[in-house]
């Protein structure tokens, strides 16, 4: 009875176990009882990242600058190219096939986490005592001005979008 299963890094062909090609190489010809599997290295623009019996290598991913993409890590014969987004943009998916501009945090919200090439801006509402009066992808909520430390008094209360307005203390006559 011929083998029905082969060992790790082998494959079954014509009732014969053959060695798979190592990462970075493609299959040229199957083994026979007394010849090895014949493999060839992938070309410069191609890769294979597993032990395989593929007759063609995969093309490296193209980081299209028209989609805001740039190369983060150049591909090798064993790894694909990794793309990331240009500054001010982030990936729309985990596979990073296109980019979109970072979100800005609206007035009343501040930046909790600045965006990266792979993640968008994370905003948070300004808590009591803090405000943001700008739409920004970088600015955190700022604390209200402390009138007391300037020997002033609050003339207008602050909100999550506006700072307090300080004014002079009323002098008793």
């Amino acid at each position: 009875e011929p083998p029905t299963a082969c060992r790790e890094k082998q494959y079954l062909i014509n009732s014969q176990c053959c060695s798979l090609c190592q990462p970075g190489q493609k299959l040229v010809s199957d083994c026979t009882e007394f010849t090895e599997t014949e493999c060839l290295p992938c070309s410069e623009s191609e890769f294979l990242d597993t032990w395989n019996r593929e007759t063609r290598c995969h093309q490296h991913k193209y980081c299209d600058p028209n989609l805001g993409l740039q190369v983060q890590q150049k591909g090798t014969s064993e790894t694909d190219t990794i793309c990331t987004c240009e500054e001010g943009l982030h990936c729309t998916s985990e596979s990073c096939e296109s980019c979109v501009p970072h979100r800005s945090c609206l007035p009343g919200f501040g930046v909790k986490q600045i965006a990266t090439g792979v993640s968008d801006t994370i905003c948070e509402p300004c808590p009591v005592g803090f405000f943001s009066n700008v739409s920004s992808a970088f600015e955190k909520c700022r604390p209200w001005t402390s009138c007391e430390t300037k020997d002033l008094v609050v003339q207008q209360a602050g909100t999550n979008k506006t700072d307090v307005v300080c004014g002079p203390q009323d002098r008793q006559r």
Epitope: P3, C6, Q16, S19, F34, E36
Partner: nanobody, 124 residues
Framework: QVQLVESGGGLVQPGGSLRLSCSAS????????MAWFRQAPGKERDFVAA????????YYADSVKGRFTISRDNSKNTLYLQMSSLRAEDTAVYYC?????????????????WGQGTQVTVSS
């Protein structure tokens, strides 16, 4: 899975003959490519001879060509090595090996199953 047990080794004079046997227990002996290897004291294990699953194709190391003959009897689950015109340099432990993966005959790492070996000593 196949288990291999060698026999037939011993002490023989230079120019003498010896026949080694390798008995395989387990199923499907005829699906294994078989070979003999040998290891002299203080040296690495070397390829001696190999035979195809159906017994029609044989390969030999240059050092034993014309002196040794490998054969198999699939009905008896047995591999043989007929050795003649023995020399002192043939002294070694002889191992029988089996594999299912396609490879050049002499690639030791391709063989998945090995016997414990039988000692052959050629001395006067």
């Amino acid at each position: 899975q196949v288990q291999l047990v060698e026999s037939g080794g011993g002490l023989v004079q230079p120019g003498g003959s010896l026949r080694l046997s390798c008995s395989a227990s387990g199923r499907a002996f005829n699906t294994y490519t078989m070979a003999w290897f040998r290891q002299a004291p203080g040296k690495e294990r070397d390829f001696v001879a190999a035979i195809s699953r159906d017994g029609t194709i044989t390969y030999y190391a240059d050092s034993v060509k014309g002196r040794f003959t490998i054969s198999r009897d699939n009905s008896k689950n047995t591999l043989y090595l007929q050795m003649s015109s023995l020399r002192a340099e043939d002294t070694a432990v002889y191992y029988c090996a089996a594999r299912r993966v396609g490879a050049v005959p002499e690639r030791e790492s391709a063989y998945e199953h090995w016997g414990q070996g039988t000692q052959v000593t050629v001395s006067s």
